[in-house]
């Protein structure tokens, strides 16, 4: 059914909008879904209906439940459901996931964090902002209208931000808090089809029998944080882990970010005590991301011992 989740904390104000939107001229009736009892419109009640809005001033844990709103136009009645949950205040600083509003992302150029649901309330500036429960102080933070602006955003600015404001109803003040996560993304970031820097395609790698050999698979995937990017080795088209040769193992190398900002990954294939049969295998360096997969093949060849021939005139 047409329903919307709403949540709040006990002893704070909570205002819920009917999920069925109508024109301002349409009447809206609110009911307790379980009892079908009408919710009063008189403002002297702690819980009362005010057109499209249902107000809990303040909310109590016992208010949790499903509320029905019926929006009535001259010819149509449309029903919505508000699923309200009121939680006890947490004693510690952690804000549980169920109290979090949608995560927002910011970057150097755009670092606005909007205070969730604030448009439903009768509030006056300024908003108070907290990060991980600490009041935000310093010139980098500016509370502007219904949002927080962070200057010179850095990755360390990621975290949980809480806005706190006062709702005023007929001269009485009620506190409201709302929390959302903020993540920082690299605005210049982009993703490319993988580019394998090493090994070269169809490279022949010289190895000495009985010695150890290392092959490095190195690929770049774009700039900034990359999602679903990987490099790996295959032997004769089989994953190293499935190939079943304990002498041959792969090890993640360094995640590299060069001065030009490229995001690259390394995977080192370590062959212990190289044997003759290792020369018969096909070694594939695979680099893959959301754009696709690129493969470079390497073969091993025996390194000839250095000949110490006499030079005759």
């Amino acid at each position: 059914k047409f329903s919307k989740q709403s949540w709040g904390l006990e002893n704070e104000a909570l205002i819920v909008r009917c999920p069925r939107q109508g024109k301002p001229s349409y009447t809206v009736d609110w009911y307790y879904s379980q009892t079908n009892k009408s919710i009063p419109t008189q403002e002297r009640n702690r819980v009362f209906a005010s057109g499209q809005l249902l107000k809990f001033l303040p909310a109590a844990v016992a208010d949790s439940g499903i509320y029905t709103c019926i929006v009535r136009s001259p010819t149509f009645n449309r029903t919505g459901y508000a699923n309200v949950t009121i939680y006890k205040k947490q004693s510690d600083c952690n804000v549980p996931d169920y109290l979090m509003y949608s995560t927002v992302s910011g970057s150097e150029k755009n670092s606005k964090i909007y205070c969730p649901t604030i448009d439903l309330y009768n509030w006056t500036a300024p908003l108070e902002w907290f990060k991980n429960c600490q009041a935000l102080q310093g010139s980098r933070y500016r509370a502007h209208k219904s949002f927080l602006v962070i200057d010179n955003v850095m990755t360390e600015d990621a975290g949980d931000y809480t806005c706190k404001f006062i709702h005023n109803e007929n001269g009485a003040n009620y506190s409201v808090t709302a929390t959302r996560s903020f993540t920082v993304k690299d605005e210049q970031g982009f993703s490319l089809f993988p580019v394998i820097g090493a090994p070269a395609q169809n490279e022949i790698k010289e190895v000495e029998i009985g010695k150890n050999a290392n092959l490095t698979c190195s690929a770049c995937f774009g700039k900034g944080t990359q999602f679903l990017a990987a490099v790996l080795w295959q032997l004769n088209g089989t994953k190293i882990t499935d190939f079943g040769e304990p002498r041959i193992q792969q090890e993640e190398g360094q995640n590299q970010s060069f001065s030009n900002g490229l995001a690259c990954l390394d995977m080192v294939l370590r062959i212990a005590d190289v044997k003759e049969e290792d020369l018969l295998l096909q070694y594939d360096c695979l680099a893959l991301n959301l754009h696709g997969l690129r493969r470079h093949t390497v073969r091993l060849s025996r390194k000839n011992p250095i000949d110490h021939h006499s030079i005759y005139c």
Epitope: K1, Q21, F76, T79
Partner: antibody
Framework: EVQLLESGGGLVQPGGSLRLSCAAS????????MFWVRQAPGKGLEWVSA????????YYADSVKGRFTISRDNSKNTLYLQMNSLRAEDTAVYYC????????????????WGQGTLVTVSS | EIVLTQSPATLSLSPGERATLSCRAS??????LAWYQQKPGQAPRLLIY???NRATGIPARFSGSGSGTDFTLTISSLEPEDFAVYYC?????????FGQGTKVEIK
């Protein structure tokens, strides 16, 4: 009584243009979002375009985007559909219809429809 | 876009029988679904809105049910004037889309 009356249909060659009109009466025209819906001969219904009551917001089906333009004149209680670069597959009965709920950015049902006007695109 | 699939394509029944028409959405439309009736040479007529609410003037023999992706229009006892094509329509998001229709014909 709510009434919608389409006009302007007819035979047109591929690549040609046509302008459909829909005259509305019996309700406050400017308070309602209006739609064009078409029905090819022997086929089902296909939404074509919609326009908000104040005329600011317009919406189009991908199949007509860039070729058709919806507009309205609230002073004349009239809805329009300007159809350019017509193709054989645009051949259909075109209905204008009213959305009785009309809240910003969302659609509802169509409670009143005109009788339709036939557009035939053929060489 | 959300695709609505109606079944069956044709329903052959006699007056007085019960008709059950199905409409399945390719993704959830909550209860933002309507049913229309269309007779030859006429414009569609709204029967049901918000999945289960009868529009003004629609006889009680027409009822709608369902939510999410599966919806049903039931005509409890077919009257001669009920033989027509029935369309479902979703309006949860743009573009609004219609099903391909179910024809209810006299057996």
């Amino acid at each position: 009584e709510v009434q919608l009356l389409e006009s302007g249909g007819g035979l047109v060659q591929p690549g040609g243009s046509l302008r459909l009109s829909c005259a509305a009466s019996g309700f406050t025209f400017s308070s309602y979002d209006m739609f064009w819906v078409r029905q090819a001969p022997g086929k089902g219904l296909e939404w074509v375009s919609a326009i908000a009551g104040e005329g600011g917001r317009t919406y189009y089906a991908d199949s007509v985007k860039g070729r058709f333009t919806i507009s309205r004149d609230n002073s004349k209680n009239t809805l329009y559909l300007q159809m350019n670069s017509l193709r054989a597959e645009d051949t259909a009965v075109y209905y204008c219809a009213r959305d009785p709920w009309s809240t910003e950015g969302s659609f509802f049902v169509l409670d009143y429809w005109g009788q339709g006007t036939l557009v035939t695109v053929s060489s | 876009e959300i695709v609505l699939t109606q079944s069956p394509a044709t329903l052959s029944l006699s007056p007085g029988e019960r008709a059950t028409l199905s409409c399945r959405a390719s993704q959830s439309v909550d209860d933002d679904l309507a049913w229309y009736q269309q007779k030859p040479g006429q414009a569609p007529r709204l029967l049901i809105y918000d999945a289960s609410n009868r529009a003004t003037g629609i006889p009680a023999r027409f009822s709608g049910s369902g939510s999410g992706t599966d919806f049903t229009l039931t005509i409890s006892s077919l009257e001669p004037e009920d033989f027509a094509v029935y369309y479902c329509q979703q309006y949860i998001g743009a573009p609004i889309t219609f099903g391909q229709g179910t024809k209810v014909e006299i057996k």
